[in-house]
């Protein structure tokens, strides 16, 4: 079995303020079992945008039904984009752990740029 890769096919995405951004992410394997998380930025100060396992993220919806059998599509939509949302977004696969899930592999990132609403 080939080791799982996290694919973020879009290096950059441009979205108008007030619109919805779609950030694409797929995994290449069902193994290892574990959730996906999305972050803005990298390193210790990164901001959690979405966690499949737990939490409440009212602006975020998943593109695919995560409970769908054998799902490997972890793309998300972020609604009502503002200039403050600009940055690089990383899709990160975690593997099921005991007791806590462990970060396994990150996608290469997608840079979100926000175009101001024409006045």
């Amino acid at each position: 079995e080939e080791e799982l890769q996290v694919i973020q096919p879009d290096k950059s995405v441009l979205v108008a303020a007030g619109e919805t951004a779609t950030l694409r992410c797929t995994a290449t394997s069902l193994i290892p079992v574990g959730p996906i998380q999305w972050f803005r930025g990298a390193g210790p100060g990164r901001e959690l945008i979405y966690n499949q396992k737990e939490g409440h993220f009212p602006r975020v919806t998943t593109v695919s039904d995560l409970t769908k059998r054998n799902n490997m599509d972890f793309s998300i939509r972020i609604g009502n984009i503002t200039p403050a949302d600009a940055g690089t977004y990383y899709c990160v696969k975690f593997r099921k752990g005991s007791p806590d899930d462990v970060e396994f592999k990150s996608g290469a990132g997608t840079e979100l740029s926000v175009r101001a609403k024409p006045s």
């Epitope: 069902l30 079992v33 409970t67 054998n70």
Partner: antibody, heavy 119, light 110 residues
Framework: QVQLVQSGAEVKKPGASVKVSCKAS????????INWVRQAPGQGLEWIAM????????HYNQIFKDRATLTTDTSTSTAYMELRSLRSDDTAVYYC????????????WGRGTLVTVSS | DIVLTQSPDSLAVSLGERATINCRAS??????????IFWYQQKPGQPPKLLIY???NLDPGVPDRFSGSGSGTDFTLTISSLQAEDVAVYYC????????FGQGTKLEIK
């Protein structure tokens, strides 16, 4: 930490119904399937059915299709399994179990609820 | 329905020796390169515990003396060096279609 806490033991008369509950915590309830499995005294494991709490999609073992009903209450992160027209051979420990990988497997289990059917 | 048949029904192995449990499916449980077989351990008075997923992948926290192998219709759970705490009943389960379990194999110490 994923936890599945089941309701207490029940004693029922033949022909009656029983409703077993399974309260989930430590994860987003709507993102993962819940399975129900039973085990008669000294016997093996028997899969009953599964439910997707996000949309109440269910799959049933044909043996239980006419007598079992799975439901969920997303406001309390609780899954329910009701079994009707009880017979003495329904005496068993009933388990709920969560599928963490959408593989139709059982990663995390409740401790079980003993249902005794006796006149 | 896919029927899983485990062999043997019971097994006695000396401490430190290898234990092997087999699970045969009535038809293939493989799809898209994955083998939809899972192994569980159940000790008396406890719920089952997932050991192996997708035939050969060790669940986190499971000692590496446990391993799974096989494809298609024939699968094996192996304990390389039996420990006292491994005494339990072991079940295979498939999810190629709706889940079913094997009948279980009781593992004891010789």
């Amino acid at each position: 930490q994923v936890q599945l806490v089941q309701s207490g033991a029940e004693v029922k008369k033949p022909g009656a119904s029983v409703k077993v509950s399974c309260k989930a915590s430590g994860y987003t309830f709507t993102n993962y399937w819940i399975n129900w499995v039973r085990q008669a005294p000294g016997q093996g494991l028997e899969w009953i059915a599964m439910i997707d709490p996000s949309d109440s999609e269910t799959h049933y073992n044909q043996i239980f299709k006419d007598r079992a009903t799975l439901t969920t209450d997303t406001s309390t992160s609780t899954a329910y399994m009701e079994l009707r027209s009880l017979r003495s051979d329904d005496t068993a420990v009933y388990y709920c179990a969560m599928d963490y990988g959408s593989l139709y497997a059982m990663d995390y289990w409740g401790r079980g609820t003993l249902v005794t059917v006796s006149s | 329905d896919i029927v899983l048949t485990q062999s043997p029904d019971s097994l006695a192995v000396s401490l430190g020796e290898r234990a092997t449990i087999n699970c045969r499916a009535s038809k293939s449980v493989s799809s898209s390169g994955y083998n939809y077989i899972f192994w569980y351990q159940q000790k008396p008075g406890q719920p089952p515990k997932l050991l192996i997923y997708l035939a050969s992948n060790l669940d986190p926290g499971v000692p590496d003396r446990f391993s799974g192998s096989g494809s298609g219709t024939d699968f094996t759970l192996t304990i390389s060096s039996l420990q006292a705490e491994d005494v339990a009943v072991y079940y295979c389960q498939h999810s190629r279609e709706l889940p079913t379990f094997g009948q279980g194999t009781k593992l004891e110490i010789k």
